[in-house]
């Protein structure tokens, strides 16, 4: 019972984590314009892995995709790769783990096969989570480096005359979503690996013991005892993640209650 619960919980946690990794990868707010200690602008810049956006205080938002592949920084490419690898591994892990779930019966699949599949999916979730955490951390490190560089060069120009105010970027919401999602996927993977140990059939062979009774001799030899729990599950399928994303390159996104002016 505990094994099934651990496996099921691991699956759900990983599912939420992978949904989060997908969401973070698609989000535009990987880096956002730093507003602290800066001249107050009527324009707000933010950037994602795939496009950069500008939101005016008027509510008009314009996003431009990074249409070049070779012109992009190597670090950004690396982050993209890590996130995509994380998503792919996570998706495969989810597929494998569905068939590995103890509450789902598929033909006459042995418990040993389910245990192997559970372990495989667990490892995939762990690697997926680590990829996401690594990707987000690399991007965060890149931001920190650029932040201090742009702070040092905040005011550029001849003879100390201010020429331009450089836009500084700080951590966006996607980074926090990515870290949390990566962590959840990692935890889910660990739980799957723990569940795998409980699923593996233990062949415990007890040595023959002779019981001598008066009158006649009886030899009692118990065979290998295999514990099996027939767990009849009535689990309902819940839709955890709906990845319906809508992107527009130029939209008048009207001022909302959370917009700044």
């Amino acid at each position: 019972m505990a094994v099934t619960a651990c496996q099921g919980l691991g699956f759900v946690v990983s599912l939420i984590g992978i949904a989060g990794i997908i969401a973070a990868t698609c989000m535009d707010q990987w880096s956002t314009q730093d507003l602290y200690n800066n001249p107050v602008t009527a324009v707000f810049n933010y950037q994602g892995l795939w496009r950069s956006c500008v939101r005016e205080s008027s509510g008009f938002t314009e996003c431009r995709g990074y249409f070049t592949l070779l012109g992009l920084p190597a670090m950004l490419q690396a982050v993209r790769a890590l996130m995509i690898v994380g998503i792919v591994l996570g998706a495969i892990g989810l597929l494998v783990s569905i068939f590995a779930l103890k509450c789902i019966r598929i033909g006459s699949m042995e418990d040993s096969a389910k245990a192997n599949m559970t372990l495989t999916s667990g490892i995939m979730f762990i690697v997926s989570g680590l990829c996401a955490i690594a990707g987000v951390s690399v991007f965060a490190n890149m931001l920190v480096t650029n932040f201090w560089m742009s702070t040092a060069n905040m005011y550029t120009g001849m003879g100390g005359m201010v020429q331009t105010v450089q836009t500084r970027y700080t951590f966006g919401a996607a980074l926090f979503v990515g870290w949390v999602a990566g962590g959840l996927t990692l935890i889910g993977g660990v739980m799957m690996c723990i569940a795998c140990r409980g699923l593996a059939p233990e062949e415990t062979n007890y040595k023959a013991v002779s019981y001598h009774a008066s009158g006649h001799s009886v030899a009692y030899k118990p065979g290998g005892f295999k514990a099996s729990t027939g767990f009849g599950s009535n689990t309902k399928n819940k839709k955890i993640y709906d990845g319906g994303a809508r992107t527009e390159d130029e939209v008048q996104s009207y001022p909302s209650k959370h917009d700044y002016v």
Epitope: Q33, P39, V40, T41, A42, V43, N45, Q47, S52, C53, V54, E56, S57, S58, G59, F60, E62, R64, V162, Q163, T164, V165, Q166, T167, Q252, Y254, P255, S256, K257, H258, D259, Y260, V261
Partner: antibody, heavy 118, light 113 residues
Framework: QVQLVQSGAEVKKPGSSVKVSCKPS????????IDWVRQAPGQGLEWMGG????????VYNEKFQGRVTLTADESTSTAYMELSSLRSEDTAVYFC???????????WGQGTLVTVSS | DIVMTQSPDSLAVSLGERATINCKSS????????????LTWYQQKPGQPPKLLIY???TRESGVPDRFSGSGSGKDFTLTISSLQAEDVAVYYC?????????FGGGTKVEIK
């Protein structure tokens, strides 16, 4: 078409307050910011502040901070600008305008002349 | 505050001739995020509210005649009326739409010579 209709001219005493209204039509009131700009007689334009009618969020020109209050009433789709502690140099035509892309003002009210005189 | 300096203060041009108005900002109005300059040009005729001509330094507002054009980047901007018409007699203002407070230039009065 888009129109912004402002309240009529006002004559005020120094130290008093004035409240000018601006009623836009031809678009959804909460979808665009409303800015207030004033113009003293024979002078240039001076931005006073702006309001997001949907949230009530405001941004002010520090020159008027504490004296100007911008509000919006969603039920009547009307924006208001109140200027307190009036002095003679506040005599001007006050305009409301709709902020659009480029943070520019595409539609303006006809203007409200506020005269501050003792 | 960002200071917007317009030159000249007034300009007398013959009908059909080119009129050029300059506007200088104390700080760059170029946004690195979209490479757009947040500068707007308005036309104001006596007794009327200002009328939007050009935004993003060079994008003409719909309905504005194509004889009006905007150019420049960073700190220096220009409004050009390629062939002055009688109805173009007005005061022209440039506006900083990037930094708060949103500031206007002092205005340039265009007259017919």
């Amino acid at each position: 078409q888009v129109q912004l209709v402002q309240s009529g001219a006002e004559v005020k005493k120094p130290g008093s307050s004035v409240k000018v209204s601006c009623k836009p039509s031809g678009y959804t009131f909460t979808n665009y910011l409303i800015d207030w700009v004033r113009q003293a007689p024979g002078q240039g334009l001076e931005w006073m502040g702006g309001i997001n009618p949907g949230s009530g969020d405001t941004v002010y020109n520090e020159k008027f901070q504490g004296r100007v209050t911008l509000t919006a009433d969603e039920s009547t789709s009307t924006a208001y600008m109140e200027l307190s502690s009036l002095r003679s140099e506040d005599t001007a035509v006050y305009f409301c305008a709709r902020r659009v892309r480029g943070n520019s003002f595409d539609s303006w009210g006809q203007g409200t002349l506020v005269t501050v005189s003792s | 505050d960002i200071v917007m300096t317009q030159s000249p203060d007034s300009l007398a041009v013959s009908l059909g001739e080119r009129a050029t108005i300059n506007c200088k900002s104390s700080q760059s109005l170029l946004n690195s995020g979209n490479q757009k300059n947040y500068l707007t040009w308005y036309q104001q005729k006596p007794g009327q509210p200002p009328k939007l001509l050009i935004y993003w330094a060079s994008t003409r507002e719909s309905g504005v005649p194509d004889r009006f054009s905007g150019s420049g980047s960073g700190k220096d901007f220009t409004l050009t009326i390629s062939s002055l018409q009688a109805e173009d007699v007005a005061v022209y203002y440039c506006q900083n739409n990037y930094f708060y407070p949103l500031t206007f230039g002092g205005g340039t009065k265009v007259e017919i010579k």
